[in-house]
Interface confidence: medium
């Protein structure tokens, strides 16, 4: 049988044969500096202690140095995302050193065995960094470790073992199984670098979460709540493969973290912004679109360094493909009810009209339920930049599309048979743009007509910059 190293093994693990490695001439961990833009080109293998080779490989001591660390592999080969990331880094940082940490022989194992090898690989990366630090011009502050899946935890071990502090570690959907809830020295954690930023794209509360759910960095960004990524449903992946299986969905969602990072490198003119929020549900309600006190940040390469005392969980919505950027809006709608309507569950849609473009018809996602005689907050997002908003069309969906809705309507009719004319009144909509932080107020076109009922629409025109209205002495509830 095969001996295993536990992630919490002692430093003497160096001297053991890592789990499941065949005794071949190939080094179990190689450091390949990518000098060519051509992914087919082998690059140049660095050798710890060989300064001449460092020179021959064109290593630039004063430039930024990126170490790309792959994760577990069942194929034993580099996946296409790695080449995309290499070329995106080379394009963005022309003078930088881009080093691929090739630990394929140790990663091409049973997942659990690959996990048990992460510590020893982290030690090897730290060893290489310690040797580089002996060179006068080399600065650990210029080092950025980028680890995907298991590679994120390798980066964590490297940052933990290195003498000094690495400038930055980016965790791209750090692996979950065997790391969730682990001690900070046995997984990626904020202590591992001066700045640790993390993208979580495959977290699940049911089944097995392939990506780690817990926050592990200074900032932890959960695109689309960190779970269901647009463009990764079975229907989406079925089109491109002979047999669509859950594995393709897993790969799509897990790997989405890499593509979001690549997007931040190649589409720097279209940065995606994430917003601090305590949880995904509050974000879905549109409560968390504030940029005050470092509450928002760019995602990926352009993330601003934030070393909070507490971990910062951040959320955003994205498109299904590159460029991933969307435009977030918070909508505050005060719903008045003049009739005793009982419990109603209206289905609202909005269309936003702007100086640049008009949005599609967007559903207002009701996370809990519409509160009557209260202000309801919603999150809407558009794929295109609408420019300055001019007007809003609010529609209450009429004819029910499902038997469930028909039943709800029938039930609510039975409870109030003498009041079939269901009606709500909305005088204005307050909108805040996440990307510009601009606040606008929209009033009904006809101040006399503020009522809306199923199958009807209501038009709102911009009536004020900002949110405070005449006769209002205090602002509405502040954003967190």
């Amino acid at each position: 049988s095969i001996t295993t190293l536990r992630p919490q093994g002692s430093l003497r693990d160096e001297h053991h044969k890592p789990t499941g490695v065949p005794a071949t001439a190939r080094p179990s961990v190689a450091f390949n500096i990518r000098t060519s833009k051509d992914p087919e080109q082998e690059g140049c293998n660095l050798s710890l202690g060989d300064s001449k080779l460092l020179e021959n490989c064109g290593f630039n001591m004063t430039a930024k140095t990126f170490f790309i660390i792959h994760g577990w592999t069942m194929s034993g080969m580099f996946e296409s995302w790695l080449h995309k990331l290499v070329s995106a880094l080379q394009m963005r940082e022309k003078d930088a050193n881009v080093v691929v940490v090739d630990w394929l022989p140790l990663a091409h194992q049973l997942y659990t065995d690959a996990v048990n090898n992460t510590r020893v690989v982290g030690q090897r990366v730290a060893g290489m960094l310690d040797w580089l630090q002996e060179k006068e011009e080399f600065s650990l502050g210029n080092v950025h470790l980028i680890g995907y899946s298991l590679g994120a935890h390798v980066a964590g071990y490297a940052g933990n073992f290195v003498k000094g502090t690495v400038g930055r570690i980016t965790g791209l959907d750090p692996a979950g199984p065997m790391f969730e809830g682990a001690d900070i020295h046995k997984r990626l954690s904020p202590d591992d670098a001066d700045f640790v930023d993390v993208l979580h794209t495959y977290t699940r509360s049911f089944g097995l979460s392939i990506g780690i759910q817990m926050p592990v960095g200074h900032i932890d960004i959960y695109p689309n709540g960190g779970d269901f990524q647009p463009g990764c449903g079975l229907n989406d992946v079925l089109g491109s493969i002979a047999y669509g299986t859950i594995t393709e969905v897993v790969k799509c969602e897990h790997e989405r973290a890499v593509h979001l990072f690549v997007d931040s490198l190649v589409n720097q003119d279209k940065p995606s912004f994430a917003f601090q929020c305590t949880d995904s549900n509050r974000f879905k309600k549109g409560i968390c679109l504030s940029c005050r006190k470092n509450r928002c940040n760019s995602i990926g390469y352009n993330a601003k360094k934030m070393r909070n005392k507490r971990n910062s969980k951040m959320y955003l919505k994205t498109r299904a493909g590159m460029p991933f950027r969307v435009y977030h809006y918070q909508m505050k709608i005060h719903v008045f009810s003049y009739k005793n309507m009982g419990e109603i569950e209206p289905t609202f849609y909005v269309t936003l009209y702007g100086t640049n473009a008009d949005s599609q018809t967007l559903p207002l996602e009701i996370v809990e339920r519409i509160e009557q005689n209260a202000t309801n907050t919603f999150l809407v997002y558009t794929e295109e930049d609408l420019g300055d908003l001019l007007k809003i069309q609010l529609t209450w969906e009429g004819a029910s599309q499902s038997w469930y809705n028909l039943w709800k309507e029938f039930r609510s009719y039975l409870s109030q048979p003498r009041n079939p004319g269901r009606e709500l009144n909305i005088r204005r909509i307050r909108v805040k743009s996440g990307e510009t932080q601009r606040k606008l107020t929209f009033c009904t076109e006809d101040p006399e007509n503020t009522s809306i009922s199923p199958g009807r629409e209501l038009w709102f025109r911009k009536c004020r910059d900002g949110w405070r209205m005449k006769n209002e002495t205090s602002p509405t509830v502040e954003l967190p």
Partner: antibody, heavy 119, light 107 residues
Framework: QVQLQQSGAELVKPGASVRLSCKAS????????IHWVKQRSGQGLEWIGW????????KYNEKFKDKATLTADKSSRTVYMELSRLTSEDSAVYFC????????????WGQGTLVTVSA | DIQMTQTTSSLSASLGDRVTISCRAS??????LNWYQQQPDGTVKLLIY???RLHSGVPSRFSGSGSGTDYSLTISNLEQEDIATYFC?????????FGGGTNLEIK
């Protein structure tokens, strides 16, 4: 849906060899590892080894490395296990099963092939 | 190799009963514990993976729990079709090993 169809029962003489097959359908063949498991009559299950068609990667249980040889034919989406130098100890039902990544479980099983070694 | 022990090789219960089958590993297996059902005709099915996750299509009366070295499978409301042999398996490290099995029969 995922299916693993195994070859029929075999009656073989001691010292001979036998080749069992496991034909996969309903999923991308090269993306999943196929495992083989042995069950002697009225007994428990023993893991023999795996074959990963994506890279022709093979792992054996130390106990079976001189007994079993795993191969595959990608064109027919079939994984084979050859058992050599058969003895009565090799009389058993042999199952093939598909590995689920990350969880290290066997989510789909073939119906089993009974091998009887008898003079 | 990691030894997997199912102390109860045979278990009798009545329909509607709550049944618990246990499994012990010779070392910590970090929740990499799976449960299989082998029906009388020899068909093998995965029930529970990674200690407590229900495989698709498996009735919710089956549940799993445990950590470290001790794990269990519970059937909350025994039905006729549950009469089978149940095996645990560790997927923590190679070689994968199985428990000896627990044969469940009707009283």
């Amino acid at each position: 849906q995922v299916q693993l169809q195994q070859s029929g029962a075999e009656l073989v003489k001691p010292g001979a060899s036998v080749r069992l097959s496991c034909k996969a359908s309903g999923y991308t063949f090269t993306k999943y590892t196929i495992h083989w498991v042995k069950q002697r009559s009225g007994q428990g299950l023993e893991w023999i080894g795996w074959f990963y068609p994506g890279s022709d990667s093979i792992k054996y249980n130390e106990k079976f490395k001189d007994k079993a040889t795993l191969t595959a034919d990608k064109s027919s989406r079939t994984v084979y296990m050859e058992l050599s130098r058969l003895t009565s100890e090799d009389s058993a039902v042999y199952f093939c099963a598909r590995h689920e990544e990350y969880t290290n479980s066997l989510a789909y099983w073939g119906q089993g092939t009974l091998v009887t070694v008898s003079a | 190799d990691i030894q997997m022990t199912q102390t109860t090789s045979s278990l009798s219960a009545s329909l509607g009963d709550r049944v618990t089958i246990s499994c012990r590993a010779s070392q910590d297996i970090s929740n990499y514990l799976n449960w299989y059902q082998q029906q009388p005709d020899g068909t093998v099915k995965l029930l529970i993976y990674y200690t407590s996750r229900l495989h698709s299509g498996v009735p919710s009366r089956f549940s799993g729990s445990g950590s470290g070295t001790d794990y269990s499978l519970t059937i909350s409301n025994l039905e006729q079709e549950d009469i089978a042999t149940y095996f645990c398996q560790q997927g923590y490290t190679l070689p994968w090993t199985f428990g000896g099995g627990t044969n469940l029969e009707i009283k």
